[in-house]
């Protein structure tokens, strides 16, 4: 019996939680926070490798 497609998301990386519009989702700590606590991602220099910066996922109104 054929199984459905497997999730690309690891077991330790749950789907981003929906935040109320007053807040933003922090990918680093994986929960909703005041948007001012997030750091806007800065462009990386070519070839540089660093941990992913905090970013916000904002629900659409």
């Amino acid at each position: 019996m054929r199984r459905g497609p497997r999730s690309l998301r690891g077991r330790d990386a749950p789907a981003p939680t929906a935040c109320v519009p007053a807040e933003c989702f922090d990918l680093l700590v994986r929960h909703c926070v005041a948007c001012g606590l997030l750091r806007t991602p800065r462009p990386k220099p070519a070839g540089a490798s660093s941990p992913a910066p905090r970013t916000a996922l904002q629900p659409q109104e």
Epitope: T17, A18, C19, V20, P21, A22, C24, H31, C32, A34, C35, G36, L37, L38, T40, P41, T55, A56, Q58, E61
Partner: antibody
């Protein structure tokens, strides 16, 4: 229609405790953040904190001015959310409002008055 | 904490006049990733609880008359009432929700001459 009704206010002695309630109707209680805000007589508003929704594990944020003395909780089965206030001081005398948080503090209750006095 | 300063603290106007009131924050409320300013305006009529008028600095809450307009960005914000009505007698508060703790301004009391 969203309706928030606070209760539990009254006169309490300094050092005492009080638990305020906010009864919620008109929306699914588990799907919204709920906040508490207070207003001393004739003064401006002060945000006390909020409790997030079910999807966010009912986590809380507090104003440092009350953190450790005040606790926000909720009883989703009864659509009520609470503000437990301990070690009350005269400066805690105010009208206390509950509010639904979405875009900002979207809907407010009518408030309940707390007086801390000997 | 972010300090919110409102001016004037009170003003008296005649019905039909245009009113502007100011709100300044001690740090920017603009989140550059989505270009939203995390600032709200509330109206509190005598003996009543506050009511949300404007969120994200300029978006009018559903049911709020279009004579109320929010503007500004960063640290300087304005609430304008294009033609005051007697029912607009109230205290108007701005509030930031850019970071914790959320903070309110001291309010602007609007009186009708």
């Amino acid at each position: 229609e969203v309706k928030l009704v606070e209760s539990g206010g009254g006169l309490v002695q300094p050092g005492g405790s009080l638990r305020l309630s906010c009864a919620i109707s008109g929306f699914t209680v588990t799907a919204y953040y709920m906040s508490w805000v207070r207003q001393p007589p004739g003064k401006a508003l002060e945000w006390l904190g909020f409790i997030r929704d079910k999807a966010n594990g009912y986590t809380t944020e507090y104003n440092p001015s009350v953190k450790g003395r005040f606790t926000i909780s909720r009883d989703n089965s009864q659509s009520i959310f609470y503000l437990q206030m301990n070690t009350l001081r005269a400066e805690d005398s105010a009208t206390y409002y509950c509010a639904q948080v979405r875009r900002a503090l979207d809907y407010w209750g009518q408030g309940t008055t707390v007086t801390v006095s000997a | 904490d972010i300090v919110m300063s409102q001016s004037p603290s009170s003003l008296a106007v005649s019905v039909g006049e245009k009113v502007t009131m100011s709100c300044k924050s001690s740090q920017s409320l603009l989140y550059s990733s989505n270009q939203n300013n995390y600032l709200a305006w509330y109206q509190q009529k005598p003996g009543q609880s506050p009511k949300l008028l404007i969120y994200w600095a300029s978006t009018r809450e559903s049911g709020v008359p279009d004579r109320f307009t929010g503007s500004g960005s960063g640290t300087d914000f304005t609430l304008t009432i294009s033609s005051v009505k007697a029912e607009d007698l109230a205290v108007y508060y701005c509030q930031q929700y850019y970071t914790y703790p959320y903070t309110f301004g001291g309010g602007t009391k609007l009186e009708i001459k």
